[in-house]
């Protein structure tokens, strides 16, 4: 284990209700704007203070968003992903992948292109 970084990858369904200022987060990624090498996925880059996502508390910077209201986010241009969120309606269901760094733990996933730096 020494000299190796391990990650525990989990998935979660997060249901957000759009607040007065929206969902309250930023994203990076897309086929035209890869955030992680060889991965065109959509990642959370900022959680805005007092926004819907921050108040819910589960979505974290660095999370990968796999789907919105059941619609897969694979192979989307960045702006198309942004538009998908903006048009997602009042109740928004997000399928997200959390990636937690673990210190020499027995359970983990060897991470390549780590989005958390």
């Amino acid at each position: 284990m020494n000299g190796r970084v391990d990650y525990l990858v989990t998935e979660e369904e997060i249901n957000l209700t759009r607040g007065p200022s929206g969902l309250g987060f930023n994203i990076v990624g897309g086929t035209d704007q890869q955030y992680v090498s060889n991965d065109s996925g959509i990642y959370v880059s900022r959680i805005k203070e007092n926004g819907a996502a921050a108040l819910d508390g589960r979505l974290q910077e660095g999370d990968k968003i796999l789907s919105v209201n059941g619609q897969d986010l694979k192979n989307l241009l960045h702006q198309d992903a942004v538009d998908l969120f903006r048009n997602a309606g009042y109740a928004v269901s997000l399928r997200v992948q959390h990636r937690l760094q673990v210190q020499n733990g027995p359970i983990g996933h060897r991470g390549e292109g780590d989005p958390s730096g």
Epitope: I27, E49, V82, S116, G117
Partner: nanobody, 128 residues
Framework: DVQLVESGGGLVQAGGSLRLSCAAS????????MGWFRQRPGKERDVVAT????????YYLDSVKGRFTISRDNAKNTVFLQMNSLKPEDTAVYYC??????????????????????WGQGTQVTVS
């Protein structure tokens, strides 16, 4: 979390120049909006200059426009503040700051324009 380490501060005569650097680690630098803030003696901390994650949008405090230039080097995970024609009133502790960049999923307008939440320890700039 993001760690920020500033360098380049010091004592300089009025009219002189300094270049501040801020090295970031902890997450991909290219996804971060970066900024320089300063706190002058007995004053609130003010934004001096900011640069967005893509490097194509900058902001400057009116009193530093034309004298200070903010830039970033994504290959080196570093943001710079080139300060020319320094004045005694530029004396302050200068702080590097960061926040997640990216596109808002809500609207083009970004509420809380100077809402930064990762901070360096600061570097002293004294202009005599």
């Amino acid at each position: 979390d993001v760690q920020l380490v500033e360098s380049g501060g010091g004592l300089v005569q009025a009219g002189g120049s300094l270049r501040l650097s801020c090295a970031a680690s902890g997450r991909p630098f290219s996804s971060l909006d970066m900024g320089w803030f300063r706190q002058r003696p007995g004053k609130e901390r003010d934004v001096v200059a900011t640069i967005n994650w893509t490097g194509d949008s900058t902001y400057y405090l009116d009193s530093v426009k034309g004298r200070f230039t903010i830039s970033r080097d994504n290959a080196k995970n570093t943001v710079f503040l080139q300060m020319n024609s320094l004045k005694p009133e530029d004396t302050a502790v200068y702080y590097c700051a960061a926040r997640g960049g990216g596109s808002s999923v809500d609207s083009e307008y970004d509420v809380g324009e100077f809402e930064y939440y990762y901070w360096g320890q600061g570097t002293q700039v004294t202009v005599s």
